[in-house]
Amino acid sequence: SQVSQNCHNGSYEISVLMMDNSAFAEPLENVEDAVNEGLEIVRGRLQNAGLNVTVNASFMYSDGLIHNSGDCRSSTCEGLDLLRKISNAKRMGCVLMGPSCTYSTFQMYLDTELSYPMISAGSFGLSCDYKETLTRLMSPARKLTYFLVNFWKTNDLPFKTYSWSTSYVYKNGTESEDCFWYLNALEASVSYFSHELSFKLVLRQDKEFQDILMDHNRKSNVIVMCGDPQFLYKLKGDRAVAEDIVIILVDLFNDQYFEDNVTAPDYMKNVLVLTQSPGNSLLNSSFSRNLSPTKRDFALAYLNGILLFGHMLKTFLENGENITTPKFAHAFRNLTFEGYDGPVTLDDWGDVDSTMVLLYTSVDTKKYKVLLTYDTHVNQTNPVDMSPTFTWKNSKLPNDITDRGPQ
């Protein structure tokens, strides 16, 4: 049946899917607070532009009977059920905000004819790449693989003079939703990361990981994993590590490394942490006071999703263009809009661009220090610390294969 869009005559609505299965275990009231804060900003911006329109959100909740595991991996049908609910109510906004689970987003794309834009705080997996009406506001797996390949190949940094072409990947299946899809993209034989490496092996058992740390016959000195320092400690403990091992810990949505009083534990000295530049303006906002650093990024993505909706609404209304058209549905990409914490750039496929930051532990200060930045928009690595105080020999990253010598 035909669903009417509440999206004309000066009244514009965004439908927000409030799903039990979410990329981050975030109370739905926090998501609602983020959306409402975003709406307030959008109303102000539209008013300042002389656009006298009404903007609201309708929150669509799951009934919670079937899908209440809270685990993204059982989310496949929940999004479709919510869409059915919208369809039965014959009420749809101009834009759909959610879902955040990759399975759910993929299934919605597979099984529906989406003629309206969809904004997701998540949907990290490669299967959600290149979707014409999907916008993702948290770094998807594709962006991570581009960084890793760029970094592996780089051999002209003051602290990295070897190209790498090998890696171990630790993936035990208990990871968070973002980590699950990041590692999935590294594991996939068809992925860019796999394609560019001459050797890659996935370690699935704790013991496999622990054995590699001192194995003289290992095929690579580099291990990629995903999680926070505590996750690494549970796995590695205080075990000895060969001097030329480099662990890359992917922890994109964690601001704790930038806090003033943070000291890096000793077990982090062989580790490079890949995270993102911190946002700080959310710290003072009403809904974020009780959020962990990770959840802050999730809430911010929802808030920015509303601001993106407002930006597109303003652009189309100012140009006198219709909102309920395929042009509007396909317009949420290749643009920069004013986010809550500064400008936000979306690439040609509607995926957020960001600055990734590689940190190391200074052996002098025991603090996390920025080694380099990587701008996903231009695929460019920039060194920040020209003389890092590394644990590795000569304060340079080792070769990925022991005793191979300079190439």
């Epitope: 003051p158 930045t373 920039n382 020209m386």
Partner: antibody, heavy 118, light 110 residues
Amino acid sequence: EVQLVQPGAEVKKPGSSVKVSCKASGGTLSSYAISWVRQAPGQGLEWMGRIIPILGITNYAQKFQGRVTITADKSTSTAYMELSSLRSEDTAVYFCARDQRPASMDVWGQGTLVTVSS
Amino acid sequence: QSGLTQPASVSGSPGQSITISCTGTSSDVGGYNYVSWYQQHPGKAPKLMIYEVSNRPSGVSNRFSGSKSGNTASLTISGLQAEDEADYYCSTVTSLSTYVFGTGTKLTVL
């Protein structure tokens, strides 16, 4: 195409401070660094310091350490350079420039002439 | 950190080639492949001509080239033209993650 816009001129008294702004128009400060470089009349270029706005990381030339503060406001894509305890020899044109790569300043502001005079 | 050493002036006739040197230490020029060269006309902002020792930004004539040997970097301008008359500065990073400029060279086209 990013342009860096600076105010034209400032006149200051010895001992006071000056805060020069540098706004990125037609783009954002992004992950690039913004350097501040000064040039006294008839003299060469002198690097003062830089900031990576997205991280708030700063580096200062030893000569200016303790007297210069570089900040940035991501939301307005504006960088600032504040120089305190001004003396007559600080009279110079102060440029901001975008570091696209280390020590590669590819976009420059038009410069702000700061005159320190009693 | 005092400036990198450049000759105060160089000159050449139209069509000739000239080279400007930039000498530092192993903690700056010698230690990193991040040497840049700038051209500055009177009353104007500097313009990036060479970055990372030998790379030219788009729009810069291929008459400009850069190189480095040990602690000394060089800028070569071939087929000298009247509009090349300007001040030229080198710059590089240091082991302190700061930058330093050269003392500057005035190029005169005779």
